[in-house]
C-alpha cells in the first residue's frame, strides 16, 4: 500500500517520462543557478512537500537530487541563511521502510548524515549546515533541478 | 482555533534558571516552526529563538546563545525554553509564536509569560 | 544584523484620518517585510505579511507597500480600535529583526 505521497511521487515521475523527449539544456534559464552539470532554481515561497514536487514538474524539472555529499556542500553554499530550509526530492517510503528518492532509488546510508527520525510523512530538507528529518506537511521552500546536457565534440570520419 | 498558552515565568534571583513552557492547540503543531519572542517593560520586540517542526533544527540571537535552549515535545503539542544564568536584563514578557524560519512571519502570538530576574 | 527604522517614533491623529508609518531596513531586505499591531497589555498581531499581503481577518483599511529597503504601512481612515503600537519586522535574515515600534495616540 502506497501512502499518498509515494502515489504522487510516482505519478509525476510517470508523466514525466511519458512525454516526448526534449532536445538537451545547454545553459540554464533565467533566475535558475549553474551547479556543475545541473540547473538549481531555489524557490522563494513555501509549500509542503507534495506541492514543491508538482511545482518542479510544471517547470519541467525535478526535487533536488544528491548525488553525493560533496554535491550536498557544494548546494548548501548556494543557501544564504543557516534559517532557511529546502525541501529536496528525498522521503520516507512505508512501504520498504527506507528513505526513497523521487527517481525510485534508495538513499546510500553513507551520502547524507540526516537529522531526526525515519518515519511516515517524513521529508527532507537540506540547510545551510545540515540535513534534516522533517514533517512533509511542513511549508517551507524548495529545491528544483534541471540536468545540463554535456556538450560532446562530434567527431566525423575522415573524408 | 489555534491557541498558544504561555507559563513558567516569574520571579528568580540573577544566576538562576527558569523553564517556560507553551501549550500548543487548534493546529498540527508538528508541521509549524515556533518561536520565542521577548519584550522588556516599556521596550519594543526581540525575537530570542526559534525551532523547526521537527525540533532537529534550533538557532538563536546572540542574547540567548549559550544559556537558553529552545525545545519541543510533538506529542504534547509543548514548546519549552529553558533559561539559564539568567540576568537583570532578561527580564520581559516572553511570547511563543507561530513561525521562525525564513520567511515565516509571526501569525499566531500567545498571551505572554513575565520573567523577571532581581535580587 | 539587519537594522529595521521606524518613523514617526510616536503619532497623534484623530478618527477617520489617514495614517502612513515607514520603515527603513539597513540593507535590502527584498518583500520580507512584516506589519504588527500590539494594544497596550497585549500579544502582538499580525496585520501584513510579505510587505503588503494583508493577513486574514484584518481590515481592509489597513495596506502595505514598498520593497528594498523601504515600507509602508497605511491605515486608510483610523478607527477607535486602531490606536496601538505598530512594529514593523524582517524575516529576510537572522536575526529576526524588529523596527522601535510607532505609537498611534488619540489627538
Known amino acids: 500500500q502506497k501512502s499518498s505521497i509515494e502515489k504522487c511521487s510516482v505519478d509525476i515521475q510517470q508523466s514525466r517520462n511519458k512525454t516526448t523527449e526534449r532536445p538537451g539544456l545547454l545553459n540554464c534559464p533565467i533566475y535558475w543557478q549553474q551547479l556543475r552539470e545541473k540547473c538549481l532554481l531555489f524557490s522563494h515561497t513555501v509549500n509542503p512537500w507534495n506541492n514543491s514536487l508538482a511545482d518542479c514538474s510544471t517547470k519541467e524539472s525535478s526535487l533536488l537530487l544528491i548525488r553525493d555529499k560533496d554535491e550536498l556542500i557544494h548546494t548548501q553554499n548556494l543557501i544564504r541563511d543557516k534559517a532557511i530550509l529546502f525541501w529536496i526530492g528525498l522521503n520516507f517510503s512505508l512501504s520498504e521502510k527506507n528513505w526513497k528518492w523521487i527517481n525510485g532509488s534508495f538513499l546510500n546510508s553513507n551520502d547524507l548524515e540526516i537529522r531526526g527520525d525515519a518515519k511516515e510523512n517524513s521529508c527532507i530538507s537540506i540547510s545551510q549546515t545540515s540535513v534534516y528529518s522533517e514533517y512533509c506537511s511542513t511549508e517551507i521552500r524548495w529545491i528544483c533541478q534541471k540536468e545540463l546536457t554535456p556538450v560532446r565534440n562530434k567527431v566525423y570520419p575522415d573524408s | 482555533e489555534v491557541q498558544l498558552v504561555e507559563s513558567g515565568g516569574g520571579l528568580v534571583q540573577p544566576g538562576g534558571s527558569l523553564r517556560l513552557s507553551c501549550a500548543a492547540s487548534?493546529?498540527?503543531?508538528?508541521?509549524?516552526?515556533m518561536s520565542w519572542v521577548r519584550q522588556a517593560p516599556g521596550k519594543g520586540l526581540e525575537w530570542v529563538s526559534a525551532?523547526?517542526?521537527?525540533?532537529?533544527?534550533?538557532y538563536y540571537a546572540d542574547s540567548a546563545k549559550g544559556r537558553f535552549t529552545i525545545s519541543r515535545d510533538n506529542s504534547k503539542n509543548t514548546l519549552y525554553l529553558q533559561m539559564n544564568s539568567l540576568r537583570a536584563e532578561d527580564t520581559a514578557v516572553y511570547y511563543c509564536?507561530?513561525?521562525?524560519?525564513?520567511?515565516?512571519?509571526?501569525?499566531?502570538w500567545g498571551q505572554g509569560t513575565l520573567v523577571t530576574v532581581s535580587s | 544584523d539587519i537594522q529595521m527604522t521606524q518613523s514617526p517614533s510616536s503619532l497623534s491623529a484623530s478618527v477617520g484620518d489617514r495614517v502612513t508609518i515607514t520603515c527603513r531596513a539597513s540593507q535590502s531586505i527584498s518583500s520580507y517585510l512584516n506589519w504588527y499591531q500590539q494594544e497596550p497589555g497585549k500579544a502582538p498581531k499580525l496585520l501584513i505579511y510579505a510587505a503588503s499581503s494583508l493577513q486574514s481577518g484584518v481590515p481592509s483599511r489597513f495596506s502595505g507597500s514598498g520593497s528594498g529597503t523601504d515600507f509602508t504601512l497605511t491605515i486608510s481612515s483610523l478607527q477607535p480600535e486602531d490606536f496601538a503600537t505598530y512594529y514593523c519586522?524582517?524575516?529576510?535574515?537572522?536575526?529576526?529583526?524588529f523596527g522601535q515600534g510607532t505609537k498611534v495616540e488619540i489627538k
Open positions: 487548534g493546529f498540527t503543531f508538528s508541521s509549524y516552526a
Open positions: 519586522q524582517q524575516t529576510y535574515s537572522t536575526p529576526l529583526t
Open positions: 509564536a507561530r513561525g521562525g524560519y525564513l520567511p515565516d512571519a509571526f501569525d499566531y
Open positions: 525551532i523547526s517542526g521537527s525540533g532537529g533544527s534550533t
